[in-house]
């Protein structure tokens, strides 16, 4: 048994007569043989669930669900209740109605076995019938909505009449009907005004019925019509078996360059027309098991269940359904030497499904793990300016396909042929497994005998110690110019183009900072700023070279405060800024401000 609503509303007036009918509550059956029996909770409740008093005023007919006044609620009774309402004005009280045999403790009131009945209290007597508006004669103030379980026996779930109005205003004629399309499973009995289902409902065919209730009021010569929405929601049960969309039960995958733990290798999708079990219960009740194969496969792969609600069209309306993605995921990083082919099977079980048929599916994954060999081109040729500053990025080295690698830990090292000309350093980028070449020793750059630098690049896979090698030839170009005395260590300090370009800074490949002119479009990623090299800074990412010194690119790397219009980077730096952004690394501060329209260059041009 279950209530067709979780809450009911009616009005209560001072000194309403004992015996006044108030409203009907309705229960629907889960099985044909069930017979509802209603009982009221012992207490009346007020604001914030305050227990006010034992209920001495309202009774229920156990078999019909009719609530009525057992005794009149007079002023003194009302004041007694108000005193207990924690000082709040007592505008609404509620009762709990339980369905026997459901034995719920008085404290809890959860649908489907309990409903709340709210009474709006008016500190006046019942108004004169002639003063009631048609809306008040027809429907409660709060619009009802109904919940009906699918596949259950049909039954009565609502009674239109406002019982106190019918009781106290017998001369006013009120008629009701439901506006509904052809073939809908509801009927309104013209005599009793009871609304019932004609047959059991199927949620997978239709989940929501947006009906309209029409009330016609006859009072003397006057006839008025009032319409209100009458929504019915069909509640789901697990009556659909999982299926494969388009019959696809097998996925094939190749594991090659992406070998990192948590990499999704392949995905198979399962469709279920149901939306139960609910999300909290779903993973526990909708199980997936990687069937035992060889131990290596069990250790290397796991299956992740990702359910998602979707909507599908049924009979011209949309109903909710569930798609379950089953992802085959790497449980650990795979060595580049691994080389295997296997078939994995996953058993999916919708454990709540009762049939007909089985709620079990078998998913198949065909997986090939290919080995990776490390290759470098035979020779790299690069040039570097004699004016380059420390940490200037001058190029990249990268084993074949390194941009596609994940879970492969390649470290790069440089071996210099001339000990006094060891100018460059290399660091491995975590993003694309490349090696970034940067200037590490500017003194060596200035030595006349270091015009050509020869290195051996060695790439080593940390897990297997496999290696690849390449020659690196670096030509040193240009002549050295001493750093200006009044220039800051960081290019980012400058807030104007001309003062930016007259200085160098850490990370500058040319020995001069570069100005990046922004697009001037509010808070933008393309803000104006001074940078050692606009190729790498700012780019919204604090790279492995920039992490070595905050002065290189505080726009990407600063963890301090940013003043002015901006969007902070994740996890640091400036993602977007307003106007011009400049930074003071030693003070851990950046400022983003409107471009200064009073630029001296403008002053000159305007003269």
């Amino acid at each position: 048994l279950y209530f067709s609503r979780d809450a009911y509303w009616e009005k209560l007036y001072v000194d309403q007569a004992a015996g006044t009918p108030l409203l009907y509550v309705h229960a629907l059956r889960d099985a044909p043989e069930e017979v509802p029996s209603f009982r009221l909770g012992q207490h009346l409740y007020g604001t914030y669930r305050t227990r006010l008093h034992e209920n001495n005023w309202i009774c229920i007919q156990e078999d019909t669900g009719l609530l009525y006044l057992n005794r009149s609620l007079d002023h003194s009774s009302w004041e007694k209740l108000s005193v207990r309402n924690r000082g709040f004005p007592l505008l609404t009280v509620y009762l709990k109605v339980f369905l026997s045999p459901t034995s719920l403790r008085e404290g809890e009131c959860q649908w489907p076995g309990c409903a709340r009945v709210y009474f709006s209290f008016f500190n006046t007597s019942f108004p004169a019938c002639s003063s009631l508006k048609p809306r008040e004669l027809c429907f409660p103030e709060t619009r009802p909505s109904f919940r009906i379980r699918e596949n259950r026996p049909p039954g009565t779930f609502h009674q239109f009449r406002l019982l106190p109005v019918q009781f106290l205003c017998p001369n006013i004629s009120v008629a009701y009907r439901l506006l509904e399309g052809e073939g809908l499973p509801f009927r309104c009995a013209p005599d009793s005004l009871e609304v019932s289902t004609r047959w059991a409902l199927d949620r997978e065919q239709r989940e929501k019925y947006e009906l309209v209730a029409v009330c016609t009021v006859h009072a003397g010569a006057r006839e008025e019509v009032v319409m209100v929405p009458f929504p019915v929601t069909v509640y789901d049960e697990d009556d659909s078996a999982p299926t494969f969309p388009a019959g696809v039960d097998t996925a094939s995958a190749v594991v090659e360059f992406k070998r990192k733990e948590d990499t999704v290798v392949a995905t198979l999708r399962v469709f279920d027309a149901d939306v139960v079990p609910a999300s909290g219960e779903l993973v526990r009740r909708y199980t997936s098991t990687l069937l035992p194969g060889d131990t290596w496969a069990q250790q290397t792969f796991r299956v992740e269940h990702w359910p998602n609600e979707t909507s599908v069209q049924a009979n011209g309306s949309f109903v909710r359904a569930t798609v379950h993605d089953y992802r085959l995921v790497l449980n650990r990083n795979l060595s580049i030497s691994e080389n295997r082919t296997m078939q994995l099977a996953v058993l999916v079980n919708d454990s709540d499904f009762q049939g007909p048929g089985a709620g079990v599916l078998l998913l198949h994954f065909n997986v090939s793990v290919l080995p990776v060999s490390l290759h470098l081109p035979s020779t790299y040729s690069l040039s570097v300016s004699r004016r380059a500053r420390r940490f200037a990025q001058i190029g990249k080295v990268c084993v074949e396909n390194c941009q596609a690698f994940s879970g492969i830990n390649v470290q790069y090292k440089l071996h210099s042929s001339g000990a006094n000309c060891s100018t460059l350093g290399v660091v491995t980028s975590a993003e694309d497994t490349s090696g970034i070449l940067f200037v590490n020793d500017t003194k060596a750059l200035r030595r006349p005998k270091c015009a050509e630098l020869h290195y051996m690049v060695v790439a080593t896979d940390q897990q297997t110690s496999r290696q690849a090698q390449a020659q690196l030839l670096v030509t040193v170009e240009g002549s050295y110019v001493a750093e200006e005395a009044g220039c800051p260590l960081s290019c980012a300090v400058s807030k104007r183009r001309l003062e930016c370009e007259e200085c160098g800074g850490l990370g500058s490949p040319t020995g001069r900072c570069e100005w990046r002119q922004g697009d001037g479009k509010g808070i933008t990623r393309n803000f104006s700023t001074c940078s050692p090299s606009t190729k790498t800074c700012p780019d919204g990412h604090c790279d492995v070279v920039e992490t070595q010194d905050i002065n290189i690119c505080p726009q990407d790397c600063l963890r301090g405060s940013i003043v002015g219009g901006h969007e902070p980077g994740e996890p640091r730096g400036i993602k977007a800024g307003y106007g011009t952004c400049n930074c003071f690394p030693e003070e851990e501060k950046c400022f983003c401000e409107p471009e200064d329209i009073q630029d001296p260059l403008c002053d000159e041009l305007c003269r």
Partner: antibody, heavy 125, light 107 residues
Framework: QVTLKESGPVLVKPTETLTLTCTVS??????????VSWIRQPPGKALEWLAH???????SYSTSLKSRLSISKDTSLSQVVLIMTNMDPVDTATYYC?????????????????WGHGTTVTVSS | AIQMTQSPASLSASVGDRVTITCRAS??????LGWYQQKPGKAPKLLIS???SLQSGVPSRFSGSGSGTDFTLTISSLQPEDFATYYC?????????FGQGTKVEIK
């Protein structure tokens, strides 16, 4: 040692043009972040900034006097020249030139760290 | 132009006193503000740049603070040679502007 020295006429007639020269030593006018400002101070009154020339040769002027001022430099002579037209008795003041540069240790911020002694200009018929 | 308002216009103090001079900008100037000391018949001298950075060779009894619109110059213990006029200068935006000065006199 860094020094700045102002030179120019002591007396100027109304409507005439004033030309002041600032000769610097101990630093180059083309060095990065080195600029020279002109500032004046009427007798018993506050300082008033007039104009500035940057190492990059860009210039900036006081808004109220912009139409009457012109600043320039000759790097080879280590001189900065200020020309002020249409002189008036209210322009009677001591005129200073000052070096504006970035401050150690981080060279983030600027200050007028070295000033000339000033030259007094009287405007009278 | 940004207005710089200094207060007080003048003050009388004794040797050893703690003296505070404030400078308020008509709009935010970050910390692009310098403090200058001028003695009669002499050129001004830079004390503090960037609102709080003490110039080399300036006694540590001078200190500066503030950011945005409100700035303070503090002399923790006034010495005989500190009797002078003090000016603030903003060089955040053109045209650069001085405050009207605060004259510190012997009480």
């Amino acid at each position: 040692q860094v020094t700045l020295k102002e030179s120019g006429p002591v007396l100027v007639k109304p409507t005439e043009t004033l030309t002041l020269t600032c000769t610097v030593s101990g630093f180059s006018l083309s060095s990065a972040r080195m600029g020279v400002s002109w500032i004046r101070q009427p007798p018993g009154k506050a300082l008033e900034w007039l104009a500035h020339i940057f190492s990059t040769d860009e210039k900036s002027y006081s808004t109220s006097l912009k139409s009457r001022l012109s600043i320039s430099k000759d790097t080879s002579l280590s001189q900065v020249v200020l020309i002020m037209t249409n002189m008036d008795p209210v322009d009677t003041a001591t005129y200073y030139c000052a070096r504006r540069t970035t401050m150690a240790p981080y060279y983030y911020y600027y200050g007028m760290d070295v000033w000339g002694h000033g030259t007094t200009v009287t405007v009278s018929s | 132009a940004i207005q710089m308002t200094q207060s007080p216009a003048s003050l009388s103090a004794s040797v050893g006193d703690r003296v505070t001079i404030t400078c308020r900008a008509s709009q935010g100037i970050r910390n692009d503000l310098g403090w200058y000391q001028q003695k009669p018949g002499k050129a001004p001298k830079l004390l503090i740049s960037a609102a709080s950075s003490l110039q080399s060779g300036v006694p540590s009894r001078f200190s500066g603070s503030g950011s945005g619109t409100d700035f303070t110059l503090t002399i923790s213990s006034l010495q005989p040679e500190d009797f002078a006029t003090y000016y603030c200068l903003q060089d955040y935006k053109y045209p650069w502007t001085f405050g009207q000065g605060t004259k510190v006199e012997i009480k």
